[in-house]
Structures are given as C-alpha cells and as structure tokens.
C-alpha cells in the first residue's frame, strides 16, 4: 500500500500529551526507530512518569483514507466491556505548512491526533519545493513552534554589513518568489531557502534538509545546505551552508531582524532573537486573555465580546464580515455554524461562510504583535478551512467606548485579515521571565 502522505514520510514526528507527561513518536510511512516499541511501531508512546514505552500503532496494520490514518495493534484493551485493540487515529486537515501532529485525547483504546498540513490539501497551492519540520519539544516537553514564521511567499532579509550582497532566507522551507514581479528576489533559484544576491546574480547557498533542532532550552537551530554538486566560484572550494540560531529573549521585547554573526567561505551563521523561539505556552492562549507568571504580560480581550446577538461588522467590498470575538454567541447571519467570523456575500446574502469558529481560537502575543486567530471555518476548494487573523493595535483613544472596531484588510488563499485598534490591546508588561 502506497504511503498516503509522501511529503511527511521523511521524518519521525513528535506529539505530546502534556497532561499525562507522554511523548509520542510518529512515523506515518515506516516505523519509528525505538527498540522498546518493537521493529514495526509507527506510533510509539513514551510515558515519562513511569519510564515505559508502548507501541500504540503498528506500521503493518495501517489503514488510510484521504483525511484519516489509523494504525492498529494486536494489543487488547477493555473499552466498556468490549474487547478492542489499541490503536492510533490521525485526522488530517489541509494547512499551509507541513504543520505538526497535535495530540487531541486518549481513551483506554484509542490515541487521537489532528494534523493540519499541506499534505492533506486537495490542491497543491501551498506545497513547497522543500520543507522540513519546524517545531521541537525541549527536555521539559514544551513545544517551540516556528511555523508562524514560515513565509508562503517572499523572504526575510538578513542584516549584514556587506553593502554588495543581500542574503535572503525563509524559515524551514524554500523561498517562493513567484508573486514578486520586479525585485532582486525574483532571480533566486527554485528550491533555495537561503539566497545570496550579488549585483544581478542570485545564488542558492542553502536548502532545508533536517528539521528544527533544540540545542538549549531557549536556542533552536536550523541548518541549510546546498544540495547540488558544483562549487560556487567565490566559496574557495567549500560547499555553502547556512545555520540559523533562533534565540528566545530573556524578557518581552519587539521582534528583531535576523543578523549575520559570522561568514567564512560561504558558511553563514545567522542569529535571530525572536519570541517565536520561546515555548508556545509563553506566547499563546486558547482563551482571550494572556496573563500570569508564565507569560510576563497581562492582556485581556474579553471586554470585546458582544452580547445580545449583536456583532461587529467589517466591510470587505464584495463581502460583509460579522465578527463576534471572545465568546460563544451565535452570529445571527451564520446559520448556527458556531462562527466567530462570518462572511456574507453582499450580492447574495444566502451565501454565508464561517471564516473561523469560536471554539477554534488562539490568542498570540509574540515579538510585539498581538493576534487573535480563528480557524476551522468552512472549506475552500483547496480543502483549506477558512480562517481569520485579527491583528490588534493599542489605541487608548479608540471609539465605541474604547473597544474600537475591526477593519478588513485583505484575503489570501482563504485566510481573512483584519486590524483592530482598541484600548484593550494595550499590553501591560511584567519583568520576571
């Protein structure tokens, strides 16, 4: 049986059940290389409290559909008096990056995971030439996830003192320049994740090969190498390589630019101080507030919730968007879709789409940007579920009793962007990270 998601096959992936202190290793096409789980384990569970290993999915006992992968085992389990077998179930959804498998829950018999990934899309519009896993768990099983830094088009400019060259990078995947008609970036060779531009020439100095690695609790490393043979004439016989070290800052701060810290014979070392390198619980919340010792900040957007069936309305030219954030109030137009953001076509108000659901909510504060994300909306033709990204700005003089109002700013591939100036986005910092 052919592997259902070939682009996910090259790596062993990790997921964590934080509540029970369990680390899962997943290899969806072969077996994980862990002796204690046996030679054919596709999903290996490591219970760190009891220091035991169990195979909870066998690579030989795999069944697959386009959106679901199940690995059975021969191990019996007792579920409500019936004799079942232990199994793992991975539900796949379309995403814009390779993404990460997320542990959902486990019963006596079934271990459930969800994975938003380009590999599950109906169309190839989000697929990279080359992409590697972009997250890692540290020794305390805390997740560090650089997926939000991945650019689907364009690149980051590396800060370099050399006026004659420009070094462009992407994170964990190659640079897509197709949407840029006239800049230097357009000359970059396909597949490159690190592109050096000198004058009118562009050179591939690195492609992603291995996934993100953790070197210390707050330092992550990504390595790019130039795959193809043939040395560049300005590299003195060496093969180009790029090492990017992502550093979690010691306290809250604005984002910084990736900086070139060393360069020798086409070996480029880049340091990037960014809060995205910090563990995810420091940056994100599933509620509308971020506060407490762990986050170093106090943010509470819950006063923006609307009651009594009213919604914020944002004009999107062809569409009207109805928003009801930080609550579970149904938007009247949205036909009981549990939508936090509802898209209604002006010319045909019967055309209604959920552009993100209120139980699929993430509040993120990273590198000085405060963002509220609603995902899991109605599907687009690509298979991607509509989502909304609301970028908040602090405005102490915002209208509407300080609440302000969301403004639609654009749409890209079924992701809807809004900005929202409000006094409730004014962040209060603590200093003890």
């Amino acid at each position: 049986q052919a592997a259902p998601f070939p682009e996910l096959c090259s790596y062993t992936w990790e997921a964590v059940d934080t509540k029970n202190n369990v680390l899962y290793k997943i290899n969806i096409c072969g077996s994980v290389d862990i002796v204690q789980c046996g030679p054919s384990s596709a999903v290996c569970m490591h219970d760190l409290d009891t220091r035991t290993y169990h195979s909870v999915g066998d690579s030989v006992l795999r069944s697959a559909t386009r959106s679901l992968l199940e690995f059975n085992t021969t191990v019996s389990c007792d579920q409500q008096g019936t004799n079942h077998r232990v199994q793992s179930s991975i539900a796949f959804l379309c995403g814009k990056t390779l993404g990460t498998p997320e542990f959902v829950t486990a019963t006596e018999c079934v271990h459930y995971f969800e994975w938003r990934t380009t590999a599950a899309c109906k169309k190839d519009i989000f697929k990279a030439n080359k992409e590697v896993p972009c997250y890692v768990f540290d020794e305390e099983l805390r997740k560090h996830d650089l997926n939000p830094l991945i650019k689907l088009s364009g690149a980051y400019l590396v800060d370099d003192s050399d006026p004659d060259t420009s070094l462009f990078i992407n994170v964990c995947r190659d640079i897509d320049t197709l949407r840029d008609p006239g800049s230097q970036l357009r000359a970059c060779p396909p597949g490159t994740a690190a592109c050096l531009v000198r004058g009118h020439q562009a050179f591939d100095v690195g492609q992603p090969r291995d996934g993100l690695k953790v070197v210390r609790k707050d330092r992550l490393v990504l390595s790019y190498v130039r795959e193809e043979a043939g040395k560049l004439d300005f590299c003195d016989g060496h093969s180009p390589a790029v090492t990017i070290t992502f550093v979690c800052p010691s306290e809250r701060r604005e984002g910084t630019i990736p900086k070139l810290t060393a360069k020798s014979n086409c070996r480029y070392e880049i340091e990037w101080i960014t809060e995205y390198a910090c563990h995810r619980d420091y940056l994100e919340s599933k509620t509308c507030s971020l506060s407490g010792e762990q986050q170093d900040v106090s943010i509470d957007l819950t006063p923006l919730a609307q009651s009594g069936g009213s919604s914020y309305i944002s004009d999107g030219k062809e569409y009207l968007f109805y928003l009801n954030v930080c609550g579970e109030t149904e938007i009247q137009f949205c036909n009981k879709k549990q939508a936090a953001v509802c898209q209604v076509k002006k010319s045909d108000t019967s055309q209604v789409k959920a552009a993100g659901r209120y139980h699929n909510q993430t509040l993120r504060y990273s590198d000085g940007d405060l963002t509220l994300i609603y995902f899991g909306g109605d599907e687009c033709s690509s298979g991607f579920q509509r989502m909304s990204v609301i970028n908040f700005e602090c405005n102490k003089t915002a209208g509407n009793d300080g609440k302000g109002t969301p403004v639609f700013t654009g749409e890209v591939d079924c992701t809807y962007f809004f900005t929202w100036d409000t006094e409730y986005a004014c962040v209060h910092h603590h200093h003890h990270h």
Epitope: K151, S153, G154, A155, Y156, L157, D159, S166, F168, T177, R179, D180, P181, G182, S183, Q184, L185, R186, E254, I257, P258, G368, D369, V389, N391, E393, T409, G410, E411, V412, F417, T419
Partner: nanobody
Framework: DVQLVESGGGLVQPGGSLRLSCAAS????????WGWFRQAPGKEREFVAA????????SYADSVKGRFTISRDNAKNTIYLQMNSLRPEDTAVYYC????????????????WGQGTLVTVSS
C-alpha cells in the same frame, strides 16, 4: 501583482507640510512591506520610510526622523506619508513601493512601484 498610484505632491514653502497618498490595488496582501522612497535630480533613489501592512511597525531614514510619519488606512488600501517641517533638500520625486521581503529598506528589494509624485520645497 500590485498597482500603486501616488498623489499629493506639489510646491510648498520651507517649514510647510504635505501629505502624500499611495492607493494600492491588486492582491495587496501578498506584499508585507510598504515603503516611500525619493529621488532628487542627479541622485540615487533613497529610502524614506516603511511600514508593515499587518502591523504598525515602521522605520525611517535618519534624515526624516521626527519630521515625517508613514501610516496606512487598511479600509482604503492606502499608505500615507505626512511630511512636516519640510526643507529644500527634501525636494524630490517621491515613490511608493511594495515588497515581499521583510525587514528591508533597499529599493532593489521592492518589486512594485508607483509612477512617483513631485515634491518641491522652495520659497
């Protein structure tokens, strides 16, 4: 691609103010940075100011810091440059530009450009 149209240039006395506008159309969210550049006669095009579309993060050339302010109106897909305390050396053609490169002020990293609007500062 993105189309950019500047307006608001003109003749102004030293110490005066002007507000330039740049209307963007097309798939504007494929670009992440919006910049104002200027080119005086016989000189190279130089960076003036930049803003990220998704947030209010801005950067300025040292020569205009404290005098010029870049801003945006997302509802109108428009970028502005408020120019105060204008000096004769600010005389130039001002261009609006868009880039898919983050953290850049280099004009060669901007792939979409407007036609420019002339600002003349003279008594």
């Amino acid at each position: 691609d993105v189309q950019l149209v500047e307006s608001g240039g003109g003749l102004v006395q030293p110490g005066g103010s002007l507000r330039l506008s740049c209307a963007a159309s097309g798939r504007t969210f494929n670009t992440y940075n919006w910049g104002w550049f200027r080119q005086a006669p016989g000189k190279e095009r130089e960076f003036v100011a930049a803003i990220r579309w998704s947030s209010s993060k801005t950067s300025y050339a040292d020569s205009v810091k404290g005098r010029f302010t870049i801003s945006r109106d997302n509802a109108k897909n428009t970028i502005y440059l408020q120019m105060n305390s204008l000096r004769p050396e600010d005389t130039a053609v001002y261009y609006c530009a868009a880039s898919i490169v983050d953290f850049t002020t280099n004009p060669s990293h901007f792939g979409s450009w407007g036609q420019g609007t002339l600002v003349t500062v003279s008594s």
